[in-house]
Amino acid sequence: LIQERRSHEVNPAAHLTGANSSLTGSGGPLLWETQLGLAFLRGLSYHDGALVVTKAGYYYIYSKVQLGGVGCPLGLASTITHGLYKRTPRYPEELELLVSQQSPCGRATSSSRVWWDSSFLGGVVHLEAGEKVVVRVLDERLVRLRDGTRSYFGAFMV
Amino acid sequence: LIQERRSHEVNPAAHLTGANSSLTGSGGPLLWETQLGLAFLRGLSYHDGALVVTKAGYYYIYSKVQLGGVGCPLGLASTITHGLYKRTPRYPEELELLVSQQSPCGRATSSSRVWWDSSFLGGVVHLEAGEKVVVRVLDERLVRLRDGTRSYFGAFMV
Amino acid sequence: LIQERRSHEVNPAAHLTGANSSLTGSGGPLLWETQLGLAFLRGLSYHDGALVVTKAGYYYIYSKVQLGGVGCPLGLASTITHGLYKRTPRYPEELELLVSQQSPCGRATSSSRVWWDSSFLGGVVHLEAGEKVVVRVLDERLVRLRDGTRSYFGAFMV
């Protein structure tokens, strides 16, 4: 796994942003904006919500999701799980990479039924060419997207 | 936007820390310590709360703020907004880069009057030479600065 | 402190994961998995919970801990402190680098006595060869480890 940075190479990096189409409700991963505004791909590609690795190496991957609601919807578990997962051709199931669990609904106060919370994940993982990383949030109904600055997903080679 | 890392160049990086003078109360951004303790600037400069880019490129920018209080002061919205914003000569207004909203006041319980919460933001953005990045917190009164380890602001080129 | 990246050198990086043995209850730092699963060391070493620096430079260090509980244990302050600390041969005591305080116990709701919260820290610090970085959580009884994806500790040179 020796990894070199050659001075003539571009270092792979990406930052993808939340958009109205991010929440599919299909049970799949979140989808992301790749070009408009702050979003970009450099030395990485994108497919159906996934960052796709072109060049093997160690990557710092990160995601933030903005959560918000009014009280806690009925039938919604009080635990929200936000995670980064790897898809690899060598294994049939997604692999958990970085995961957080939060209980944000308890944040509604007597003076304010509206609550907001944010979940940030970041860490270094080794990724092979062709492997994919996706973001999942359960329950995604509480994710607030708005303008791409509050929920996002990115990576860069270290 | 092809960006190369030449082996003889220093990679721009900075870590700025909270200080007693960080909260201005003027509606401006937070101000930061740039030299003492853990704070440093390397290939970036600082002006009135802003990290100023010397060399164009993609930067991982980050900020953490420590929030704390007893209950929630009246006149203080129960939502706290913590964000990283860009100032560019090409546009008159600040542009949101990375933003979080939290509702920390709901954390005070009968068994504990004092609550603490922390907000972390980090992500990769493209910055041109001369552009500036600042941190804002609304309401800034709830930010705990003190010793420089709990609230901070930094960046490095990726 | 001029730091160069030579193209033939490997960039130091590490990602350590939580394991059943992480919580010692001895008042020491958290211990980590260094080899299995997602854990790795590259250009850094490990000793008794500490990442040990081999090559001096600026490092982005990070840690996430998953917190969880049922209500709040009696005798536990509602404040949880999660921090990254430096041990250096030149100074007898640990130095705080990055610290967060949270009040997660207040998150238990009437509909759910179980609560979850996550604390993320990350920032750039200068580390000399031989210096060590450790993670501490007070009260560590609330740290939830499980499978190495929820609580972790890492670093990479920038």
């Epitope: - | 929030l67 209950g71 002061p73 004092v114 930010v143 705990r144 600065l145 | -």
Partner: antibody, heavy 121, light 107 residues
Framework: QVQLVESGGGLVKPGGSLRLSCAAS????????MNWIRQAPGKGLEWIAD????????YYADSVKGRFTISRDNAKNSLYLQMNSLRAEDTAVYYC??????????????WGQGTTVTVSS | AIQLTQSPSSLSASVGDRVTIACRAS??????LAWFRQTPGKTPKLLIY???SLESGVPSRFLGSGSGTDFTLTISSLQPEDFAIYYC?????????FGGGTKVEIK
């Protein structure tokens, strides 16, 4: 300047009532928690009640629960303590105190001069 | 209720002396502790908050330390105005409680 001035103390018989007032000036009263603390002659300090700034959440010490009522009027920059069913052991100097509770600043940093309540037959 | 036990309850010292007062909480209160000084006939004055933060305008000879259950107030060089009663107070948990006080007298 920042100031708290208590009034309303006096001599009252056991079982009687008194209403203490605390007038605030020089700061944004509505931003702060407010507390009542008392000190019996020759004794230490005893916290008796507080009221939040935001939603008027109130807590009392067990020794006064059900007998004393704390309230505030942010429009008038005033804090009150209605004391009913007074007992001899309620005899004390009563202080109101402002409490900071945000970010880097905590603690009861501003106290009134105190008003004396004597409960005696 | 959380009990705060101060020790000693009284002490005699001279101007210029270094004085240490301890405050022990019956359970963990993190850093939610304040120290007050009260001179006869006067209102209490906040010296230290959040266990170790010096209140604005308070001389630097006052030093607060500790967290969890054990706290200390140190006066590095006693001045004439420091002969008074000192109280610790926890603001972490209801009901708020004060220590019994430590009387610092002239030797």
């Amino acid at each position: 300047q920042v100031q708290l001035v208590e009034s309303g103390g006096g001599l009252v018989k056991p079982g009687g009532s008194l209403r203490l007032s605390c007038a605030a000036s020089g700061f944004t009263f509505s931003d702060y928690y407010m507390n009542w603390i008392r000190q019996a002659p020759g004794k230490g300090l005893e916290w008796i009640a507080d009221i939040s700034s935001r939603d008027n959440t109130i807590y009392y010490a067990d020794s006064v629960k059900g007998r004393f009522t704390i309230s505030r009027d942010n429009a008038k920059n005033s804090l009150y303590l209605q004391m009913n069913s007074l007992r001899a052991e309620d005899t004390a100097v009563y202080y109101c105190a402002r409490e900071r509770g945000f970010g880097d600043y905590f603690g009861m940093d501003v106290w009134g001069q105190g008003t004396t309540v004597t409960v005696s037959s | 209720a959380i009990q705060l036990t101060q020790s000693p309850s009284s002490l005699s010292a001279s101007v210029g002396d270094r004085v240490t007062i301890a405050c022990r909480a019956s359970q963990d209160i993190s850093s939610a502790l304040a120290w007050f000084r009260q001179t006869p006939g006067k209102t209490p004055k906040l010296l230290i908050y959040d266990a170790s933060s010096l209140e604005s305008g308070v001389p630097s000879r006052f030093l607060g330390s500790g967290s969890g259950t054990d706290f200390t107030l140190t006066i590095s060089s006693l001045q004439p105005e420091d002969f008074a009663i000192y109280y610790c107070q926890q603001f972490n948990t209801y009901p708020l409680t004060f220590g019994g006080g430590t009387k610092v007298e002239i030797k």
